[in-house]
């Protein structure tokens, strides 16, 4: 995976964040797979710091070694720091685990920014605030890395929750979630509620804050309002979906829908931003600029390079438009839309120089690898990764940040014809020739 500002990402911080909550509505969905209702032991099991990723506590080995692991739906390896590193307070010590098995194989994973390599093995893994099971899973023990771990992020590894097709070094390396489902009676479904802060947090608040929930094996109804709408997983590699229409404040971008999915559209908790293909990004920014023209912002702001600040509590949310993505529905010629607020796509950052101000970065950015629905999107919604039924569900998150005038929304159905034509078919090419140099 790992594209652009890809990993690690913006974390969910305050839980519950400030702002109004929506009342629960009746759930219109018929039987969902997995256990229904309350997964109280898994609620609030994610933490993080703004821009640095949502992580869950996991244990590895015998006796158990506790590590914080970044939750990443945009990759498929379970990989943990396994050697001293200046940014790691702790790491997996294979020699201390009586259940570690060496696979005698190395793995190298380069991202657009940053890379790591490690040695493959298997060990016993469990999630203390997850299902009460222990599974033997593949683990990449990270022995060398560059621009991967983040100083002060508080996580020591990454849990890739996508499919085997994109696992490194190849698709024969079974991902963690596949092992979990195979070795237990846990249903093949998980769901994520990422709770963005909505305001900058100082270090103390950030470390103490709850960032959200990863529900393994089902859906927790306390985490969303309204109903769940599902979009098909187009192909099981990344969590690939099809966007059929994009609107800014209700105004259609009017592009060929293939452009929205060029060369793919994925749901990726390991990416901070909403990332859009070049043409789409340019059209979207033009439209957002026009809608918010009562204030002028520097070009660097729209490029995600410069902060904009307002006096504490005076952020003019109302001048910024909502962004709606229409996703292919489960029924032929039917779509639904998810709508995010500026509270999602303006990312709060702490600016030491102006700590009395509220400062933000524009968290929509350009991509050369398709649309990436990162934390900016996911923080508005409860997202259900229903692998059993090859679909992804969206509902309004009970913890999303909003104001008294607007909330994030999931609405439908809408009639949309020829949605299949919106998918881009990637040409099959030979492996890329990445040349580096060897020991």
């Amino acid at each position: 995976t790992h594209l652009g500002i890809r990993l690690p990402l913006r974390s969910g911080l305050a839980g519950p964040p400030l702002g109004l909550r929506l009342p629960r509505e009746t759930d219109e969905e018929s039987e969902e797979p997995g256990r229904r209702g309350s997964f109280v032991e898994m609620v609030d099991n994610l933490r993080g710091k703004s821009g640095q990723g949502y992580y869950v506590e996991m244990t590895v080995g015998s006796p158990p070694q506790t590590l914080n692991i970044l939750v990443d739906t945009g990759s498929s390896n379970f990989a943990v720091g396994a050697a001293p590193h200046p940014f790691l307070h702790r790491y997996y010590q294979r020699q201390l685990s009586s259940t570690y098995r060496d696979l005698r194989k190395g793995v190298y994973v380069p991202y657009t920014q940053g890379k790591w390599e490690g040695e493959l093995g298997t060990d016993l893994v469990s999630i203390p605030h997850g299902p009460n099971v222990t599974v033997r899973a593949n683990i990449a023990a990270i022995t060398e890395s560059d621009k991967f771990f983040i100083n002060g992020s508080n996580w020591e590894g990454i849990l890739g929750l996508a499919y085997a097709e994109i696992a490194r070094p190849d698709d024969s390396l079974e991902p963690f979630f596949d092992s979990l489902v195979k070795q237990t009676h846990i249903p093949n479904i998980f769901s994520l509620q990422l709770c963005g802060a909505g305001f900058p947090l100082n270090q103390t608040e950030a470390l103490a804050s709850v960032g959200g929930s990863m529900i393994i094996g089902g859906i927790d109804h306390s985490l969303y309002t309204g109903r769940l709408w599902y979009t098909p997983i187009r192909r099981e590699w990344y969590y690939e979906v099809i966007i059929v229409r994009v609107e800014i404040n209700g105004q259609d971008l009017k592009m060929d829908c293939k452009e929205y999915n060029y060369d793919k559209s994925i749901v990726d908790s390991g990416t901070t931003n909403l990332r859009l293909p070049k043409k789409v990004f340019e059209a979207a920014v033009k439209s957002i600029k026009a809608a918010s023209s009562t204030e002028k912002f520097p070009d660097g702001f729209w490029l995600g390079e410069q902060l904009v600040c307002w006096q504490a509590g005076t952020t003019p949310w109302n001048i910024f438009p909502v962004i709606s993505l229409y996703l292919m529905g489960e029924v032929t010629n039917q779509s639904f839309r998810i709508t995010i607020l500026p509270q999602q796509y303006l990312r709060p950052v702490e600016d030491v120089a102006t700590s009395q101000d509220d400062c933000y970065k524009f968290a929509v950015s350009q991509s050369s690898t398709g649309t990436v629905m990162g934390a900016v999107i996911m923080e508005g919604f409860y997202v259900v990764f229903d692998r059993a039924r090859k679909r992804i569900g969206f509902a309004v998150s009970a913890c999303h940040v909003h104001d008294e005038f607007r909330t994030a929304a999931v609405e439908g159905p809408f009639v949309t014809a020829d949605m299949e034509d919106c998918g881009y078919n990637i040409p099959q090419t030979d492996e890329s020739t990445l040349m580096t140099g060897r020991a």
Partner: antibody, heavy 124, light 108 residues
């Protein structure tokens, strides 16, 4: 100019031990993976062991696994090969070679440059 | 592990001749193949990396081609200093890495 200079070779009895060193200069040593490659008299090249830039990753040929240990001291710009339980078939010229990056498992790599080699003879 | 097979194991040629050495991998290695030259009593020297990229300082009479499993090293006009042994090696897989058996180029 990048230079690699091996030392520590010599005559040793079967079952004995030797420690080879490779002193590096002319480049940022810690930024590059390093390897040991050997060549038995009149034979071809055989890769022996490699270590990543920080020393976190190491790997060995099956023929030496459990007997040889590769290590590095980045503060001294020196690569080592500790050879224990030596056998007659370990007799060879041992070369150290620089990789093109810090990575051990990255595809598309090569050995360049190589040291001049040090001869290890295992004989009773 | 991937096996590398070089042919011929030796060849005799004259100065000015065009010489071709082949290397075959036991499975596809894309373009991840390197060629080295070794003269008697000396350390090997990198000639070509990534199947066809000439290492800095190597004369242009050396060239490499191929991808997948079959690769070729060509010396367009053999010079006296080119009499040596040539080795290929793959860098597609993670270690352990293997070299070809070598091709000795001798004076006819």
């Amino acid at each position: 100019e990048v230079q690699l200079l091996e030392s520590g070779g010599g005559l040793v009895q079967p079952g004995g031990s030797l420690r080879l060193s490779c002193a590096a200069s002319g480049f940022t040593f810690s930024s590059y993976a390093m390897s040991w490659v050997r060549q038995a008299p009149g034979k071809g090249l055989e890769w022996v062991s490699a270590i990543s830039g920080s020393g976190g990753s190491t790997y060995y040929a099956d023929s030496v696994k459990g007997r040889f240990t590769i290590s590095r001291d980045n503060s001294k710009n020196t690569l080592y090969l500790q050879m224990n339980s030596l056998r007659a078939e370990d007799t060879a010229v041992y070369y150290c070679a620089k990789g093109g990056s810090q990575w051990l498992y990255a595809p598309g790599s090569w050995f360049d440059p190589w040291g001049q080699g040090t001869l290890v003879t295992v004989s009773s | 592990d991937i096996q590398m097979t070089q042919s011929p194991s030796s060849l005799s040629a004259s100065v000015g001749d065009r010489v071709t050495i082949t290397c075959r991998a036991s499975q596809s290695i894309s373009s991840y193949l390197n060629w080295y030259q070794q003269k008697p009593g000396k350390a090997p020297k990198l000639l070509i990396y990534a199947a066809s990229s000439l290492q800095s300082g190597v004369p242009s009479r050396f060239s490499g081609s191929g991808s997948g499993t079959d690769f070729t090293l060509t010396i367009s006009s053999l010079q006296p200093e080119d009499f040596a042994t040539y080795y290929c090696d793959e860098s597609y897989s993670t270690p352990p890495w293997t070299f070809g058996g070598g091709t000795k180029v001798e004076i006819k």
